[in-house]
């Protein structure tokens, strides 16, 4: 009778094992082991027992002990079971961004690993088991479907193998794949809203706003704003599930014409885009040309208005005849024209919009000086000791300087409140002077005062003065 010990062995792949072959007869003709494995016999006393070291055990094997005894031949098998953890445990690659609501198939592939009967494949989200199946096939493949939800954003999915050798007195061997981090997103089907001027003038700045609602996660959304080839640099403001991107756009003469304004929102592996056309135009203000901005009264003045070749102008409210970019008017400058504004309004149609530009020039008419009865009365009669304000207004441009002098030496305080004394009486020569010339006007001031009649105790001086036509003024004595 042949026996083997141990009859069952579980060992790691590539490992070694001692196998003892025994026989029941004392003097066996033959005692040995049959195995393809490398073997080494360990010498022991006696003839009925042999110990072999079997090494580099790579796969399950059934070495067989045999003996030839006088009563016959017999054999005994030992069962070597090799265990090893899988060489590859991995999740099939997936795009990191997944839209919410999509069915996501997780596929785990396991290569190697034994004994397969003890090998299980587990699919996990975080630590939560999604599916557990025995490893079947080579490679073994386990799949599960997940409906992508918002709250899956940032979740880690992984695959784990469990080689459970605890019933054989060993431990539980686990192998885990590299995690797959899921990024979930919501990008609405509606395109972004783009608000911008339809027309934009050369050398000006416009504001472009691009916005979109219903995004998740909004902070991950990328916004690209561009006008033609010009990338804009927006300032982005985020809401809970919305954003608003605001950018300033400057345009130059090179941009003139129709340009495409684009706003693209990229989230995950999807994008939404809105296109709009912006017409960039050049429209300088019309030019108002006066033959001379400052002219003397009576001068012929030509006022011209010139604008963009495609514009239509009106000069002081009168449309050009024929309707077009030029208008002019002729006038003879009068004092009433001083300070008169000549306004040219030009209208240009750009992409269906009417653009208006204005330019105003003022005409200065030099005239005067003037002194007339209405504004500088020639005669004043005032009671003595009353408060009066002599008024005399000189007209002209530039405004004349006015001085009223009696005898070239006594000024009349024009526009000042004065106490009327006999001193004030007399004829004043009012002179208005400016760069345009000089005019004079005589102004007489009469002072009403009761005459001294003389009488007892009187000096009689008044009689002498009256007779000689001499008047006494408080400060001056002179002949009338």
């Amino acid at each position: 009778q042949t026996s083997v010990s141990p009859s069952k062995v579980i060992l790691p792949r590539g490992g070694s094992v001692l196998v003892t072959c025994s026989t029941s007869c004392d003097q066996p003709k033959l005692l040995g082991i049959e195995t393809p494995l490398p073997k080494k016999e360990l010498l022991l006393p006696g003839n009925n027992r042999k110990v072999y070291e079997l090494s580099n055990v790579q796969e399950d094997s059934q070495p067989m002990c045999y003996s030839n005894c006088p009563d016959g031949q017999s054999t005994a098998k030992t069962f070597l079971t090799v265990y090893w953890t899988p060489e590859r445990v991995e999740l099939a690659p997936l795009p990191s961004w997944q839209p919410v609501g999509k069915n996501l198939t997780l596929r785990c592939q396991v290569e190697g690993g034994a004994p397969r009967a003890n090998l299980t494949v587990v699919l996990l989200r975080g630590e939560k088991e999604l599916k557990r199946e025995p490893a079947v096939g080579e490679p073994a493949e386990v799949t599960t479907t997940v409906l992508v939800r918002r709250d899956h954003h940032g979740a880690n999915f992984s695959c784990r193998t469990e080689l459970d050798l605890r019933p054989q007195g060993l431990e539980l061997f686990e192998n885990t794949s590299a995690p797959y981090q899921l990024q979930t997103f919501v990008l609405p089907a509606t395109p972004p809203q783009l608000v911008s001027p339809r027309v934009l003038e050369v050398d000006t700045q416009g504001t472009v706003v691009c916005s979109l609602d219903g995004l998740f996660p909004v902070s991950e959304a990328q916004v690209h704003l561009a006008l033609g080839d010009q990338r804009l640099n927006p300032t982005v403001t985020y809401g809970n599930d919305s954003f608003s991107a605001k950018a300033s756009v400057s345009v130059t003469a090179e941009d003139e014409g129709t340009q495409r304004l684009t706003c693209a929102v990229i989230l995950g592996n999807q994008s939404q885009e809105t296109l709009q056309t912006v017409t960039i135009y050049s429209f300088p203000a019309p030019n108002v040309i006066l033959t001379k901005p400052e002219v003397s009264e009576g001068t012929e003045v030509t006022v011209k208005c010139e604008a963009h070749p495609r514009a239509k102008v009106t000069l002081n409210g009168v449309p050009a005849q024929p309707l077009g970019p030029r208008a002019q008017l002729l006038l003879k400058a009068t004092p009433e024209d001083n300070g008169r504004s000549f306004s040219c309004s030009a209208t240009l149609e750009v992409a269906g919009q009417l653009i208006h530009k204005n330019q105003t020039r003022e005409l200065r008419v030099l005239y005067g000086p003037r002194l007339d009865e209405r504004d500088c009365p020639g005669n004043w009669t005032w009671p003595e000791n009353s408060q009066q304000t002599p008024m005399c207004q000189a007209w002209g441009n530039p405004l004349p300087e006015l001085k009223c002098l009696k005898d070239g030496t006594f000024p009349l305080p024009i526009g000042e409140s004065v106490t009327v004394t006999r001193d004030l009486e007399g004829t004043y020569l009012c002179r208005a002077r400016s760069t345009q010339g000089e005019v004079t006007r005589k102004v007489t001031v009469n002072v009403l005062s009761p005459r001294y009649e003389g009488g007892s105790g009187g000096s009689g001086l008044n009689d002498i003065f009256e007779a000689q036509k001499i008047e006494w003024h408080e400060e001056n004595l002179y002949f009338q």
Partner: antibody, heavy 117, light 110 residues
Amino acid sequence: QSVEESGGGLVKPGGTLTLTCTVSGFSLSSHAMGWVRQAPGKGLEYIGIIGSSDRTYYASWAKGRFTISKTSTTVDLKITSPTTEDTATYFCVRDPYDSYDDGYRLWGPGTLVTVSS
Amino acid sequence: AYDMTQTPASVEVAVGGTVTIKCQASQSIYRYLSWYQKKPGQRPKFLIYDASKLASGVPSRFEGSGSGTEFTLTISGAQSDDAATYYCQQAYSSGSIDNAFGGGTEVVVK
């Protein structure tokens, strides 16, 4: 347009001296003319004025001692019985009371009168 | 009488400094006031008329102000050439007055 004084020099106290102001480039019929003096180390002192109508006006201290008169092109200042106090530079000035700016107010260069025995 | 009182009699100023000269009339002369600059051996130079109007060719650093009885001449950013005696003159009344001119203010520029 210019004004120039003449007639200054040495005069004995109690004598008589007449200074003449000759004008050119304007008419005396439309301008007032005045006389101002400055004694050595003293300030400007107003003497009097003759108006465009030939009327005369004097400082209170000058009445009776000074007489201003004019012809078509000259204005005279007569000093009666001068004293050493009257030693000064005498200036003739056009329109001293007119406040127009004619580029500058016309003053003569002045003439020095020395009263000494 | 329209007597003119000028203060101070003398003032010292550094180049670039500011000088203020005051002139007071004994009764209102409205705005009829002129200012003169007088240097030894030279005729008076007309600076300001009607209290605040600058005569032709006068630098803008000279400024006149006031009306009625109180008047001021201000020299801002004084220059060495501004060293002179300055006089105010009332141009309102020519009769029965002691002097149409103020007593003068000597300006020394250091």
